[in-house]
Structures are given as structure tokens and as C-alpha cells.
């Protein structure tokens, strides 16, 4: 099935980083400066991916694969293959229409992306705050008052909380 | 594909509860967050609280604080929703949504949505 | 917390331009995300950010914000958009609250 298929079209001979070039008779050229293919048997090459202002080169354009871009310091990558580049916060902080703005009182957010999200009411869980929340921290909860009565055993503190942010990609 | 899929409907008495689940696929079950919003019949949209599967954590509206559990089993990618002292205005469809999220621009947006849950309180 | 308000109902032309509007003081400080919910279905996004698009909603959903004002427009309206819209953001407690929805009718 290859051989006839090869027989019936040249173009499917010509390896990645090749095209197959109609005006030289479909012979199998190389792609030019700044163009690649990542298949064989294509009939042009892409264009590389170019990465200016706030993106940087992290894996330079080869004739078999294209350029991949990250984000140049103070910025985070958004999107399938880091097609755009987003303002980093400072902890404490989130993105908002006007920029980076101090998490609210009441909020908090311990990573430089993501967005501010309320302290755990230690109370729905029958605790009590152990550890005041800031604007970069959780609050940390720890035993119910009853437990802290004289007699009670001494605390072990609690691990610590897992804050909200997302998982790191 | 991306699915959030949950719990058939539910009929209770007043003054029970109910347990509602979401079990999600098609993703890194840690990597985003599930909130749960509800529809009364003919209403809109009302938000009941958020979870973080990954760790735990919790946040829940006003409305609903001692009322509301979100919890979650990570073994089976599953979140729940349990809602006690049921009341006949708690009669709606309950869904679960999934916070855009992941490597996405946090725009505070429900990008996938469960089918819902009917759960009808009526003595 | 916060509230967000939407008319209750807006009608248009079959092909014509209709803006939902979504007000709220929250809206100074987060954008607003927009939900398409026809009878029977679960709510759909259908614009998030200021004018972001996900996939597979129509380049006719548009996005603008203005001050505590987000909108959501409809370039040449389709019989297949008429729907209830649903605003959403957060408030600056961490909370999200929904506006009460625009029932939208095409004409």
C-alpha cells in the first residue's frame, strides 16, 4: 500500500523539513530560513513562530519544529502553548480591570497569578483561628474552643492549610 | 471530552438533606476549582459556594454558611454537595460548574457545566 | 455582598443589533462573564474577560465594559439566540453573584 501510494503521490517521500515543491516538478526541497515542517509529506513549510516584546525564545525554530515562546520576567504564560503573556501580581495581590490590586480584607491569594479568594471560616468546622489570615495567607484553623478548655491536652499544631491556589501546570 | 456528570434527582421531606455529586473527567481533577450554583423553578442563578479539590479548601455564600458541605474524593475525581434542613425553597436544580482555569487567564468564568440535579423538597 | 441588575427582558429583529447590559459595583473592579441558558439546558458561557470568546460561541457575541457597566451584544441577531443571559462576577469579598437575567426574544 505505501509503494502505490508513493507511486501515485511523490510528495508523501518527502520528510519533515522538507516540502514538496510543485514548481521544481515535486521534488522534495528544504524548507527556507524561519520555516519548518513538523510532518512529511507536507506541500509548504510553516512560517516559525516569532517571539518579540513580552515573549522570549525558550526552544529555538528548527527546519522539523517551531520556535516555543515563555514569558519574559514578570510575566506568566496563558493559553495552549503560551499564546499569551499576562502581568505577575505580588502575592497578596490579583489582576484586575485597573492592574494588580491588594486582595480585600477578608481575601487573600499566596501566588502571583490566580485571584484573591476568601479565608476559611474556621467556625463552619466547630474550630477556632489559630492563626490570623493576611492578605497573602489563609487563616489557619485549629481546635474547637471546648478543646482548648484547661485539662485539654496540649495543641499540636495543624499542617498547614492548603491554600486555594491552582496546582501548578 | 471535559464532562461534569452528577447525581440523579432527589425527592425529600423538610428538615432533611440531600447529597449531591459531580463526577468530572476528561482533566487533571486538581487543577481547577467546582463551584455549585443552583436554579429555583422559573429563577436565576444563584451561587452557593466554591471547593479547591486539591486540598480542601472552601468558600461558601452568605445565604447557605451552616447550611452547605463541599466536599470531594479524590480517588474517584468526584465533588459533592450536601445541603441540610431542607426547606420548600430549596426546591431547584442544583448544578456544578467548573472554574476556567488551569494555564487560562482566570477570568472568573464557569467554562463547563454538570446537567443538574433536580431536588424537590415537598412533605 | 453586592448585586449585579439586568432588564428582565429585551426583544429584537431577526438580524438586528441588541446590547444586554449588566450593572454593579463589583463591575469597577472585575470584568463580568455572560451565560446563555435555553429552556431545559444547562447555562452556556458565552463570553468571559471584557471580550473574550471561548470556542465555538459565534463572532456575532461581543464583549465591552464601561465603568460598573458590562454589556454583551449581538451583531445580527439569529432566531437560535433567543435565551435567558445570565452576568456573573465576583464582588470584593471573594463571593460571585449572579445579575437576574435578561429574557432576550427575537423578533
Known amino acids: 500500500f505505501e509503494r502505490t501510494r508513493s507511486l501515485q503521490d511523490p510528495c508523501s517521500n518527502c520528510p519533515a523539513g522538507t516540502f514538496c515543491d510543485n514548481n521544481r516538478n515535486q521534488i522534495c526541497s528544504p524548507c527556507p530560513p524561519n520555516s519548518f515542517s513538523s510532518a512529511g509529506g507536507q506541500r509548504t513549510c510553516d512560517i516559525c513562530r516569532q517571539c518579540k516584546g513580552v515573549f522570549r525564545t525558550r526552544k529555538e525554530c528548527s527546519s522539523t519544529s517551531n520556535a516555543e515562546c515563555d514569558c519574559t520576567p514578570g510575566f506568566h504564560c496563558l493559553g495552549a502553548g503560551c499564546s499569551m503573556c499576562e502581568q505577575d501580581c505580588k502575592q497578596g495581590q490579583e489582576l484586575t480591570k485597573k492592574g494588580c490590586k491588594d486582595c480585600c480584607f477578608g481575601t487573600f491569594n499566596d501566588q502571583k497569578r490566580g485571584i484573591c479568594r476568601p479565608w476559611t471560616n474556621c467556625s463552619l468546622d466547630g474550630k477556632s483561628v489559630l492563626v490570623n489570615g493576611t492578605k497573602e495567607r489563609d487563616v489557619v484553623c485549629g481546635p474547637s474552643p471546648a478543646d482548648l478548655s484547661p485539662g485539654a491536652s496540649s495543641v499540636t499544631p495543624p499542617a498547614p492549610a492548603r491554600e486555594p491556589g491552582h496546582s501548578p501546570q | 471530552q471535559v464532562q461534569l456528570v452528577q447525581s440523579g434527582a432527589e425527592v425529600k421531606k423538610p428538615g432533611a438533606s440531600v447529597k449531591v455529586s459531580c463526577k468530572t473527567s476528561?482533566?487533571?481533577?486538581?487543577?481547577?476549582?467546582i463551584h455549585w450554583v443552583r436554579q429555583a423553578p422559573g429563577q436565576g442563578l444563584e451561587w452557593m459556594g466554591i471547593?479547591?479539590?486539591?486540598?480542601?479548601?472552601?468558600s461558601y455564600a452568605q445565604n447557605f454558611q451552616g447550611r452547605v458541605t463541599m466536599t470531594r474524593d479524590t480517588s474517584t475525581s468526584t465533588v459533592y454537595m450536601e445541603l441540610s434542613s431542607l426547606r420548600s425553597e430549596d426546591t431547584a436544580l442544583y448544578y456544578c460548574?467548573?472554574?476556567?482555569?488551569?494555564?487560562?487567564?482566570?477570568?472568573?468564568?464557569?467554562?463547563?457545566w454538570g446537567q443538574g440535579t433536580m431536588v424537590t423538597v415537598s412533605s | 455582598s453586592s448585586e449585579l441588575t439586568q432588564d428582565p427582558a429585551v426583544s429584537v429583529a431577526l438580524g438586528q443589533t441588541v446590547r444586554i447590559t449588566c450593572q454593579g459595583d463589583?463591575?469597577?473592579?472585575?470584568?463580568a462573564s455572560w451565560y446563555q441558558q435555553k429552556p431545559g439546558q444547562a447555562p452556556l458561557l458565552v463570553m468571559f474577560?471584557?471580550?473574550k470568546r471561548p470556542s465555538g460561541i459565534p463572532d456575532r457575541f461581543s464583549g465591552s465594559s464601561s465603568g460598573n457597566t458590562a454589556s454583551l451584544t449581538i451583531t445580527g441577531a439569529q432566531a437560535e439566540d433567543e435565551a435567558d443571559y445570565y452576568c456573573?462576577?465576583?464582588?470584593?469579598?471573594?463571593?460571585?453573584?449572579f445579575g437576574g437575567g435578561t429574557k432576550l426574544t427575537v423578533l
Open positions: 460548574a467548573r472554574e476556567l482555569g488551569g494555564n487560562v487567564r482566570r477570568d472568573d468564568a464557569f467554562d463547563i
Open positions: 456573573n462576577s465576583r464582588d470584593t469579598s471573594g463571593s460571585w453573584v
Open positions: 463589583s463591575l469597577r473592579r472585575y470584568y
Open positions: 476528561g482533566y487533571n481533577f486538581n487543577t481547577y476549582y
Open positions: 471547593i479547591n479539590p486539591s486540598g480542601g479548601y472552601t
Open positions: 474577560g471584557e471580550d
